[in-house]
């Protein structure tokens, strides 16, 4: 139960944590299990113990084996085992399965790929990221803290992602790489910041004085059933019900529609017998959910009657 698999590449740094943990004040002794030989704590050694951590700086294939750690407290001892395998560097691009960390999944929303084991190392930003051995370039990829963010994830983003960073130990630098698979799932549902499909921002709608006019506010909120999502109209920043103009009414209830699999809502604003003063008002289509509020503004302009005289 208290055994942990760890792996690394020759000539890279590898740091392994004891699978048994205790207070920072407890002493931890490390041994090479095959020979029962104690691992030194002096940092001048290539392989040395530092409390709960066993450091290979850098690692060599011959370091492979089982290491025993014993956490010692005044009242008890706890024993753990670290099964360490150091592999030769591959000449080709393929990362074999035995070097892969756990697979992570992403979706249509922003996805994060965390660099495995990085919290064990003394590293400084930025991380370098590679996909199938190619350095990642383009605005969709952002190296942030200990993870990679991919914007607008697509199925083509699936693949093996490698993070590369430098571990610093007493002024000496050691390279570390770690690889994990990333899969893209077709999600059952999600919510997103509202996207207004209509009207366009700052749209001018032509209307005829004395006639009726309809304005439709339409927005999408994600995939699947949406909770606390709404579209509505405001006049000069005021709710329709509070504005007090009976000629201008919102349709009762919101119509739900689906566009490209997205859940959308629309609300119609009906203006009866359009008057000159209606052209002076600001009409705001608001779409909101728990992610926030988006607003598109519409103004009305008089439609010029067709001139029949030439």
């Amino acid at each position: 139960k208290f055994s942990k698999q760890s792996w690394g590449l020759e000539n890279e740094a590898l740091i392994v944590r004891c699978p048994r943990q205790g207070k920072p004040s407890y002493t931890v002794d490390w041994y090479y299990s095959q020979t029962n030989k104690s691992i030194p704590t002096q940092e001048r050694n290539r392989v040395f113990a530092s409390g709960q951590l066993l450091k290979f700086l850098p690692a060599a294939v011959a370091d492979s084996g089982i290491y025993t750690c014993i956490v010692r407290s005044p009242t008890f001892n706890r024993t753990g085992y670290a099964n360490v395998t150091i592999y030769k560097k591959q000449s080709d691009c393929n990362v074999p399965d035995y070097l892969m960390y756990s697979t992570v999944s992403g979706s249509e929303k922003n996805s994060k790929i965390y660099c495995p084991t990085i919290d064990l190392y003394n590293w400084t930003a930025p991380l370098e990221w590679f996909k199938n051995c190619q350095a990642l370039q383009g605005s969709r990829y952002r190296a942030h803290k200990s993870f990679l963010v991919i914007d607008n994830v697509m199925t083509e983003d699936a693949g093996d992602y490698t993070c590369k960073f430098i571990h610093n130990e007493n002024g000496a630098n050691y390279s570390v790489t770690a690889t994990r698979s990333f899969t893209v799932k077709d999600e059952q549902g999600f919510s997103l910041f509202p996207v207004i499909g209509a009207p366009a921002q700052n749209e001018i709608k032509e209307v005829e004085i004395g006639k009726n006019a309809n304005l439709t506010c339409s927005a999408c909120f994600g995939k699947g059933t949406q909770f606390l999502a709404a579209v509505l109209w405001q006049l000069n920043g005021t709710k329709i019900t509070d504005f007090g103009e009976p000629r201008i009414q919102q349709e009762e209830g919101q119509n739900q529609s689906f566009s490209n699999g997205l859940a959308c809502l629309d609300m119609v604003l009906r203006i009866a017998d359009v008057k000159e003063e209606d052209l002076l008002l600001q009409y705001d289509c608001l779409a909101l959910n728990l992610h926030g509020l988006r607003r598109h503004t519409v103004r009305l302009s008089r439609k010029n009657p067709i001139d029949h005289h030439s």
Epitope: E187, F227, L290, L293
Partner: antibody, heavy 125, light 107 residues
Amino acid sequence: QVQLVQSGAEVKKPGSSVKVSCKASGYTFTNYAIIWVRQAPGQGLEWMGGIIPVFGTADYTQTFQGRVTITADESTSTAYMELSSLRSEDTAVYYCARVSTNYYDSSGYYAFDYWGQGTLVTVSS
Amino acid sequence: DIQMTQSPSSLSASVGDRVTITCRASQSISSYLNWYQQKPGKAPKLLIYDASSLQSGVPSRFSGSGSGTDFTLTISSLQPEDFATYYCQQTYHTPWTFGQGTKVEIK
């Protein structure tokens, strides 16, 4: 500082209704959504519904649809949760909480950042 | 709705221990995950949002990590005031759902 203060404990008979209030202070009430969560004795957290006060938009999770009504009074910066047709399994602590998204600068993250102290509702014959 | 599953449901630990709680989502939720702490008779308190960001005023011994479906809350050195129940919550799809909780007790 931001505070949500809820009304006191209630003892109710099965079949009756209860109305719990949640008074907000220390921030602009209309800029944030308020949600209601309940916790039965020794159980986890269950989301009931919520309201976006400035627009009066309320919504309820499927479990509570038809039995719960959430309202907000902008003038007193108070949100209300009314639960009807009470049964013994509705005995729980009811919490109001603020959603961290500010509607007027769309800033922040998505979480319940401030909570009321809770209101114990006991349903017993 | 998205199901959130926490493990373990309870654990016993000593002051100074490093404690790890995991949370798994029934579908990928990117990094839209929060962690809350609740003490008996009190309301929950937000600790971590967006999987790894520490809420203002929360001690740095609390940290969160993970993305996709698997997430972790770590308390690097358990303090007496940390004995409580911890809940994860997804904010990827409404309604935002909670895990069933993990109770951290004194050994």
